[in-house]
């Protein structure tokens, strides 16, 4: 059956979000990144549950800390300045979850490193894309 245009748009937005998150993860994992050890000391809150677009609220709330850690890296690995990357992500997240959402994010008890955090949200995006395909 043909995919609806709204579903296609959601898929493309998720793909764009994935691209940005994978770009950050690649930059962090780059073997030339000398600040990786320090970056891994920063802790991020993880969602208790992330299965629907509304759960992107949990990602949105962690974007400021993410930007701060990326600024620390001062790396050319990210292809864009951290501020621009986070701005891109923020715009997409707002479009995907809806700006009028009243969803209250619930966080897991355990915090995570930046790598675990990014992996979690990349997995989330890929999972939603797969269900929409």
């Amino acid at each position: 059956a043909p995919t609806s245009s709204s579903t296609k748009k959601t898929q493309l937005q998720l793909e764009h979000l994935l691209l940005d998150l994978q770009m950050i993860l690649n930059g962090i994992n780059n073997y030339k990144n000398p600040k990786l050890t320090r970056m891994l000391t920063f802790k991020f809150y993880m969602p208790k549950k992330a299965t629907e677009l509304k759960h992107l609220q949990c990602l949105e709330e962690e974007l400021k800390p993410l930007e701060e850690v990326l600024n620390l890296a001062q790396s050319k690995n990210f292809h864009l300045r951290p501020r621009d990357l986070i701005s891109n992500i923020n715009v997409i997240v707002l479009e995907l979850k809806g700006s009028e959402t009243t969803f209250m994010c619930e966080y897991a008890d355990e915090t995570a490193t930046i790598v675990e955090f990014l992996n979690r949200w990349i997995t989330f995006c890929q999972s939603i894309i797969s269900t929409l395909t």
């Epitope: 994935l18 994978q22 997995t123 890929q126």
Partner: nanobody
């Protein structure tokens, strides 16, 4: 080292056509999601077109009906056919290839400049 190499950019008049190519090493081609995004000075990066490992395609509203993404698995190459080009399509175009499973490797090229001007 894994590389993606774009080609086909250049100067074209409004209403004209260009075909961009993205040549990859075979290890990152089959099964990977691939796409094209563009960056114009002072603008947000825009994801233009995507093609999955299975061949499903998706386009930004701004290029729908004008651009066509395709891939030739036998040549490890992806293409972006751009027709009815407009001034607002002027940008550096980058191709990328990404894993759809952990460790989520991402590769992208150096970009090719497309200028639409009379």
């Amino acid at each position: 080292e894994v590389q993606l190499l774009e080609s086909g950019g250049g100067l074209v008049q409004p209403g004209g056509s260009l075909r961009l190519s993205c040549a990859t090493s075979g290890t990152i081609f089959s099964g990977y999601t691939m796409g094209w995004y563009r960056q114009a000075p002072g603008k947000q990066r825009e994801l233009v077109a995507v093609i999955s490992g299975g061949g499903d395609t998706n386009y930004a509203d701004s290029v729908k009906g004008r651009f066509t993404i395709s891939r030739d698995n036998s040549k490890d190459t992806m293409y972006l056919q751009m027709n009815s080009l407009r001034a607002e399509d002027t940008a550096v175009y980058y191709c990328y290839s990404r894993e759809v499973t952990p460790p989520w490797k991402l590769y992208w090229g150096q970009g090719t400049l497309v200028t639409v001007s009379s």
